[in-house]
């Protein structure tokens, strides 16, 4: 069954997938699709690489890692509830029926706005007297209550950058990984 990953509305979601190239630069085509992995290819393709580069992608979907070293983990930017679902990472190893397929379950939950802990000096220094958010209503900029008008998209982006840099390292070990060659 699928491994489950979670994110909140407005965050960037991270779906880990890795392989080890047989030799440096000896890349294998990879596709990411929304929906469980079919027999061949990926359904509803959101991103694709070939032997050299990312040759197809759609908005909000990108590879944050070094795909030339086999890190083909998918980042989905500014997620909404509708991004929930099964995603397929397919490593298209040459030969008949050699592909490695990984189904990853992404569950998005509503965002929660909470008071900023005082220990987050780096965050509150940039945005004094403010609430941290994990991203409300991504369809348009939202501002918080009686505070000065503050663009939550900017706050979410900063929070996501801090979080993603840690999360990428945390999840590398738990992701889908194969070795080729």
């Amino acid at each position: 069954s699928e491994v489950e990953y979670r994110a909140e509305v407005g965050q960037n979601a991270y779906l880990p997938c890795f392989y080890t190239p047989a030799a440096p630069g000896n890349l294998v085509p990879v596709c990411w699709g929304k929906g469980a992995c079919p027999v061949f290819e990926c359904g509803n393709v959101v991103l694709r690489t070939d032997e050299r580069d990312v040759n197809y992608w759609t908005s909000r979907y990108w590879l944050n890692g070094d795909f030339r070293k086999g890190d083909v983990s998918l980042t989905i930017e500014n997620v909404t509830l509708a991004d929930s679902g099964i995603y397929c990472c397919r490593i298209q190893i040459p030969g008949i029926m050699n592909d490695e397929k990984f189904n990853l379950k992404l569950v998005i939950k509503p965002a929660k706005v909470t008071p900023a802990p005082t220990r987050q000096r780096d965050f509150t220094a940039a945005f004094p007297r403010m609430l941290t958010t994990r991203g409300h209503g991504p369809a348009e900029t939202q501002t918080l209550g009686s505070l000065p008008d503050i663009n939550l998209t900017q706050i979410s982006t900063l929070a996501n950058e801090l979080r993603d840099s840690r999360l990428a390292n945390d999840l590398r070990d738990s992701g889908a990984t194969i070795r080729i060659g």
Epitope: L81, S84, G85, K109, K112, P138, A139, E140
Partner: antibody, heavy 119, light 107 residues
Framework: QGQLQQPGAEVVKPGAAVKLSCKAS????????MQWIKQRPGQGLEWIGE????????DYNQNFKGKATLTVDTSSSTAYLQLSSLTSEDSAVYYC????????????WGPGTLVTVSS | DILMTQSPSSMSVSLGDTVSIICHAS??????IGWLQQKPGKSFKGLIY???NLEDGVPSRFSGSGSGADYSLTISSLESEDFADYYC?????????FGGGTKLEIK
């Protein structure tokens, strides 16, 4: 999937308060957000708010702030909607609904409770 | 608030017909839309979520489509149990908002 049980009806006096229940069964209560919705004949559907039973976090429709309070009792797997200072405008059917497996917020609905505000 | 404009408000159709109900949102809702069914005197049932996905146990004659601000629910080969009220609901932004409903009646 699970089931949601709600009392059929409540009759309350103007100015009073009422606490409506929504008892969940057949699933892990704390794993899924609960929505509350109001339906008045000829007025369509209004979203009241939602609650995460795992930590009591709530989001409210601003139109219902001060009118509605959402709570849960995890020991009995029950969600509650309390309505205060009732008027005839509050006479309606109130539904709870739980999210589905892939964050579909309105997947499964309770049968609804008809609240009648009458002296 | 996001306004969900649903049309038509009612329609008379025959068994076996294929019908489509439209919802237009006042802004892009990025497929954060559900479709609900309410039979007379009864509660609601979720039919479609995230624009195109069928809720568990929903017959395949129901389908959802659309993107951006425009979405539709299609029921093919109508059966007697499909005569009911249908609503769309957006959940990309607070507050969640509903369409005004469509009543499907037997011609």
């Amino acid at each position: 999937q699970g089931q949601l049980q709600q009392p059929g009806a409540e009759v309350v006096k103007p100015g009073a308060a009422v606490k409506l229940s929504c008892k969940a069964s057949g699933y892990t209560f704390t794993s899924y957000w609960m929505q509350w919705i109001k339906q008045r004949p000829g007025q369509g559907l209004e979203w009241i708010g939602e609650i995460d039973p795992s930590d009591n976090y709530t989001d409210y429709n601003q139109n219902f702030k001060g009118k509605a309070t959402l709570t849960v009792d995890t020991s009995s797997s029950t969600a509650y909607l309390q309505l205060s200072s009732l008027t005839s405008e509050d006479s309606a059917v109130y539904y709870c609904a739980k999210e589905g497996a892939f964050s579909s917020p309105f997947a499964y609905w309770g049968p609804g409770t008809l609240v009648t505000v009458s002296s | 608030d996001i306004l969900m404009t649903q049309s038509p408000s009612s329609m008379s159709v025959s068994l076996g017909d294929t019908v489509s109900i439209i919802c237009h949102a006042s802004q892009d809702i990025r497929s954060n839309i559900g479709w609900l069914q309410q039979k007379p005197g009864k509660s609601f049932k979720g039919l479609i979520y995230h624009g195109t996905n069928l809720e568990d146990g929903v017959p395949s004659r129901f389908s959802g489509s659309g993107s951006g601000a425009d979405y539709s629910l299609t029921i093919s080969s109508l059966e007697s149990e499909d005569f009911a009220d249908y609503y769309c609901v957006q959940y990309v932004q607070f507050p969640r908002t509903f369409g005004g409903g469509t009543k499907l009646e037997i011609k």
